[in-house]
């Protein structure tokens, strides 16, 4: 997150970190059920670990952790490598989690976003761009959702339905390592970081988001199916 | 050097348990998925089930039942048991390891495990 | 079922030309598709994952494309060393598969 601020501790409990060994974050995740994430099927590796209920980056042991191995994961059939389109994933936990202040799953969000509706994103990802700088602690940042049309004018015959822009001052923006993570926006799951300019936080180059209304049939089905 | 290297008797009796183990080097068994897939005299790949860091296991459909993996982190070793073989068993047995990417980027030089009596 | 189906199962060619195996599954696999490379007597060797990406140490004359159901291998001029049978792999799932394998295409010498 570029020139976000430390998220509030326990104010972000859906949010998940996707860790290779030993202890390397390289997405973010979100808590949908007690028992599912959801992060970018860009995000996709064979042998991973969820954590949910840490705040801090290193892999210091904090009280409200809960630890977890993934033992399906699910990318939408319509997602298609290098490209962006359906850039979603579900993602089954080995267990079902322990519900407390600190992990709880959000909703996801049935309606559409709508220009200016103001989100909050959040991640562990790099604050600076293109140079690496990662955080101490979770980052959050609030963002408004652009129009379609200003998202397709800057990013031209890159943007379908499956996406939305979101962002706010130039220099302000998601960026690598925060895939996957949430948009949320009146208190649902609006969103997943999936992809925008390099270096992140330029003018007139906002993150591009999943546009999670257009899945949630797709969500419901899924988890019924495997679970 | 990253290695994977097969063995076990190359003759098993029909109705026995055909055991191979798979000996790992040159990379942590905990930081990646195993497979083991064999290929009959003359015809293609055959997929048998894969292992993770986690112990989660996945088999073929086909190998439900009759096929046990396992693993031993310690002595960086993947283990293969089929039971009730049959002439139909007759392969060569690889085990390959999975670069995260899904792909199978390390094979073993596999083993030829004959089921005759 | 997510069986796959790779065509042809043999092709004769000669040094130069340009080569096109295709693989496809019953249903999508987004773009989790890996292509091998076996010599006789010898293990698969990992060319290409995520439809399109070069494992390392691959020439650049092999290429992979496609999404969803339909992949296609093309090896763009074909060398001494690239007469073998070919395998395609599908990754999207492990869930009930009787192969995650194709039947293969023996690419051999005109």
């Known amino acids: 997150i570029i020139n976000g601020s430390d998220c509030d501790m326990h104010t972000q409990p859906w949010q998940a970190a996707l860790l290779l060994r030993p202890n390397q974050l390289y997405c973010g995740a979100v808590l949908v059920h007690p028992q599912w994430l959801l992060t970018a099927a860009h995000c996709r590796k064979k042998v991973f670990r969820v954590r949910l209920g840490h705040y801090s980056l290193s892999p210091v042991y904090e009280s409200g952790q809960q630890m977890f191995q993934g033992v399906k994961s699910i990318p939408h059939p319509g997602y298609s490598h290098p490209g962006h389109s359906n850039d979603l994933m579900l993602i089954k936990l080995n267990r079902r989690i322990r519900p407390t202040k600190d992990v709880r799953p959000i909703n996801v969000s049935s309606h559409c976003p709508s220009a200016g509706t103001k989100c909050l994103v959040s991640g562990w990802g790099t604050t600076k761009s293109p140079q690496v700088h990662f955080p101490k602690v979770l980052q959050c940042l609030n963002i408004s959702v652009l129009s379609q049309k200003r998202c397709e004018d800057a990013y031209p015959r890159q943007i379908d339905d499956t996406m939305f822009c979101a962002g706010d001052k130039a220099g302000r923006d998601s960026c690598q390592g925060d895939s996957g993570g949430p948009v949320v926006c009146n208190g649902s799951l609006q969103g997943l970081v999936s992809w925008g300019d390099y270096p992140c936080a330029r003018p007139n180059r906002p993150g591009v988001y999943t546009n999670l209304c257009k899945f949630t049939k797709w969500i419901q089905e899924t988890i019924q199916a495997n679970s | 050097e990253v290695q994977l290297q097969e063995s076990g008797p190359g003759l098993v009796k029909p109705s026995g348990t055909l055991s191979l183990t798979c000996a790992v080097s040159?990379?942590?068994?905990?930081?990646?998925?195993m497979s083991w897939v064999r290929q009959p005299p003359g015809k293609g790949l055959e997929w048998i089930g894969d292992?993770?860091?986690?112990?989660?296991?996945d088999y073929a459909s086909w190998a439900k039942g009759r096929v046990t993996i396992s693993q031993d982190k310690s002595k960086t070793q993947v283990s293969l048991k089929l039971s009730s073989v049959t002439a139909a068993d007759t392969a060569v047995y690889y085990c390959?390891?999975?670069?995260?990417?899904?792909?199978?980027?390390?094979w073993g030089q596999g083993t030829l495990v004959t089921v005759s009596s | 079922a997510y069986d796959m189906t790779q065509s042809p199962s043999s092709l004769s060619a000669s040094v130069g030309d340009r080569v096109t195996i295709t693989c496809q599954a019953s249903?999508?696999?987004?773009?989790?598709l890996a292509w091998y490379q076996q010599k006789p007597g010898k293990a698969p060797k990992l060319l290409i994952y995520?439809?399109?990406t070069l494992a390392s140490g691959v020439p650049s004359r092999f290429k992979g494309s496609g999404s969803g159901t339909d992949f296609t291998l093309t090896i763009s001029s074909l060398q001494p060393e690239d007469f073998a049978t070919y395998y395609c792999?599908?990754?999207?799932?492990?869930?009930?598969?009787?192969?995650?394998f194709g039947g293969g295409t023996k690419v051999e010498i005109k």
């Open positions: 390959a390891r999975d670069n995260n990417d899904y792909g199978l980027d390390i």
């Open positions: 040159g990379f942590p068994l905990s930081n990646y998925a």
């Open positions: 292992i993770y860091p986690s112990d989660i296991i």
């Open positions: 249903q999508s696999i987004s773009s989790w």
């Open positions: 995520l439809a399109s």
């Open positions: 792999q599908q990754g999207y799932t492990n869930s009930n598969i009787i192969n995650t």
